[in-house]
Structures are given as C-alpha cells and as structure tokens.
C-alpha cells in the first residue's frame, strides 16, 4: 500500500454513471471483466467494496504551502474482494487485478465530491486523470474540464 496512508473505513455501494448506467462485474473465462450498461429497474445491481484511506499531503507537495489531507479509495467487486480496480497507465484502461497482499499505487483513486450526488475518482499515480466512461467501458480520461459528465459516478447504498 501507499506510504503514510491509513484505512479510515470501508463500505459497500453500487456504482452507476451520470447517465444512470450500472457498473457491473462479469466472470468470463475465469476472469472478471467490467461492464457499463443499462440495468433494469428490478435487476439487482453489482456492488463494490470501497475502502477509504486518508493520505497526508505535506506542504512541500501541496502546491499551496500548507499541509493537507486527501481522501482516497480503492475498489473491489463485492463478489471477490481480493481483486482491485486498477489504473493501467500504458493503455489508459481500467482493469481488475488480483493482488498479493496490499494494493499497488495504481489501485488508489483520490475521491472528488463533484456535487450532492456525484463523485469522481482521480488516479493517484496519474494526477489529472480520472476513471471515466468511454464506449460503454471504464477507461482513464484526462480531464481538462472537470465538470465533464463522463467522469461522474453515483455511489448508492443498497
């Protein structure tokens, strides 16, 4: 795990996009893949386990000369909490990867509260890059305009 971070809490939630599509995890050939699609009202939504971490941001790194703290998350399908959403900086994809002991930096995302209902996930290892939706897939999106809808997600308690 990342130096200096400490686990605050963890809780399950369903993850949906700004356009009300569900993020789900489907087992294909022994591996989980991530789908973004319309789910029926009666269809049970997949859940993710969100682990919330506090990460210090020393004045030397903060850019505004004062110590700060960031709230970060990593996410696992509730079906298998030993795999994590992972930011692949080679092809700007979002993957599920099985971990050994603790998640690598690529599995951590800085949480941004964008509005009353929506959050965004900024890659810890790629500042300025967010989990987004492209062609019904999760992908990494370099966000110039942070208010862009394709990086906004709703976390819902089941």
């Amino acid at each position: 795990s990342i130096q200096g971070t400490s686990l605050l809490t963890q809780s399950p939630a369903s993850l949906s996009t700004y356009n009300d599509q569900s993020v789900s995890f489907v087992l294909e050939n022994g591996c989980y893949v991530i789908n973004v699609d319309d789910s029926g009202k009666d269809q049970e939504q997949d859940q993710v386990l969100l682990r919330y971490y506090e990460s210090p941001c020393p004045a030397s790194q903060s850019g505004d000369g004062v110590d700060g703290k960031k709230l970060m998350v990593n996410m696992s399908p509730i079906k298998d909490t030993d795999i994590w959403l992972h930011a692949n900086d080679k092809d700007y994809s979002v993957e599920l990867q099985r971990g050994d002991v603790s998640p690598p930096e690529q599995a951590f995302f800085v949480l941004h509260k964008k509005s009353s209902d929506f959050v965004s996930f900024e890659c810890k290892n790629l500042p300025g890059t967010y989990i987004g939706v492209k062609d019904n897939q999760l992908a990494l999106v370099e966000e110039k305009d942070e208010s862009c809808n394709n990086i906004m997600f709703k976390l819902s308690k089941i």
Epitope: T9, C57, G65, V66, K69, K70
Partner: antibody, heavy 121, light 107 residues
Amino acid sequence: QVQLQESGPGLVKPSETLSLTCTVSGFSLSKYGVHWIRQPPGKGLEWIGVLRAGGTISYNSALMSRVTISEDISKSQVSLKLSSVTAADTAVYYCARDHYYYSSFGGFASWGQGTLVTVSS
Amino acid sequence: DIQMTQSPSSLSASVGDRVTITCLASQTIATWLAWYQQKPGKSPKLLIYAATRLADGVPSRFSGSGSGTDFTLTISSLQPEDFATYYCQQLYNTPYTFGQGTKVEIK
C-alpha cells in the same frame, strides 16, 4: 496559515438581500470546498451551502430559493447572498473550509470568526 | 434530509468526570460524522472527523466511536476548558445537518 474572514453589513432591512464575503488565505479554492453555516442567537448550527473545489455548488434545500453562493478565485473570495430576508435570518454567519482536499467527508477543519447579521427595520 | 438527534441536550459534570454524548442519525451515514466544540462567542472547533479520528491538536482525552446510525463522543476526564457546547454533524449527504447540541456545564 489557514485563515477565513467573513465581512459584510451587520444590519439588513427586512425583504432586502443579505450579502457577505469570505476572504480566504493559506489555501487554494481549487483544492478545498468552502461552506457557509449560520447560527441564530442562542440556537444551533444550520448548514447553508458549499462551493466545492471543482466550482460546483450545493445548497440547503430549505434555503435554496433565496440563496446564491459564488466565487472570485482571483481575490480568494467566496460570496453569500440571501434574498428576501426576515427577522428569522438574524444569525452569526460563518464560512468554513473542508478538512479534506476535494471532499466534505471529513468535516470542516477551519472556520472564520463569524459575523453577526441582524435583520431589522 | 438526514436528521441528527443528540442526547442529552445538556449535562452537569465535574472536573475529572467521564462524559459521554450520543448522536443518532435518521439513516445510515457510514462513518461520515464529525464532532465540534463551541465556546460562547467563538467559532466551532473540529474535534473528531470520520467518527473516530482525532483532529490536529485535539487532546487524546476526546474520542469518538460508532458507525451507521449510532455515534458517541467521550471525554475521558473532563477538564475546566472542556465546558462548552458540543455538536455532531453528518457529512454523508447534503444538507450536512447538525445535531441540536449538548451543553456541558459545571456541576
């Protein structure tokens, strides 16, 4: 160090608009949300609204029809306007900064000293 | 809106006493709860965030516990400077509602 300072008229007439400014220093409005909270004399705290780090704004639905929050990043200022005020809006008005970058989940770590606004003719 | 109910609304205690204040949320808020201390004529001061985390510079006699809907602020050994009003606040959803406050007075 982190500072927030509320300013504005201490007396507003009924039906007029209350206007306050929160001037901040020691942190960036692009990283931290700034909230407005009020406290009527001898009573509890009421959250009014927030200007989030990304520039989006959320309001308390009980006040939404009358309240406007805006920012002037170049002046490091966040403004509050409350229209059609009545005596019930008499309160100490505070601005406060989020504990965490980019989110409010950690509460409000730094507060201004507050400014008393009295609504009276 | 999420309602936050604090109890008691006031209490009298002596220096050295252990003091417990409870806060009940009308729906689950995970651990997104903060506690503040306010003295007369002063701004609130953050004591506890994320239900259990001590804010910077806050003495270790203050502690927080709970998750979901039930939360507690404990002062293990009350000091003269602790006589004040204490508020809980949920940060799970807007509007970020406060409890009505608990006034801790000298017995």
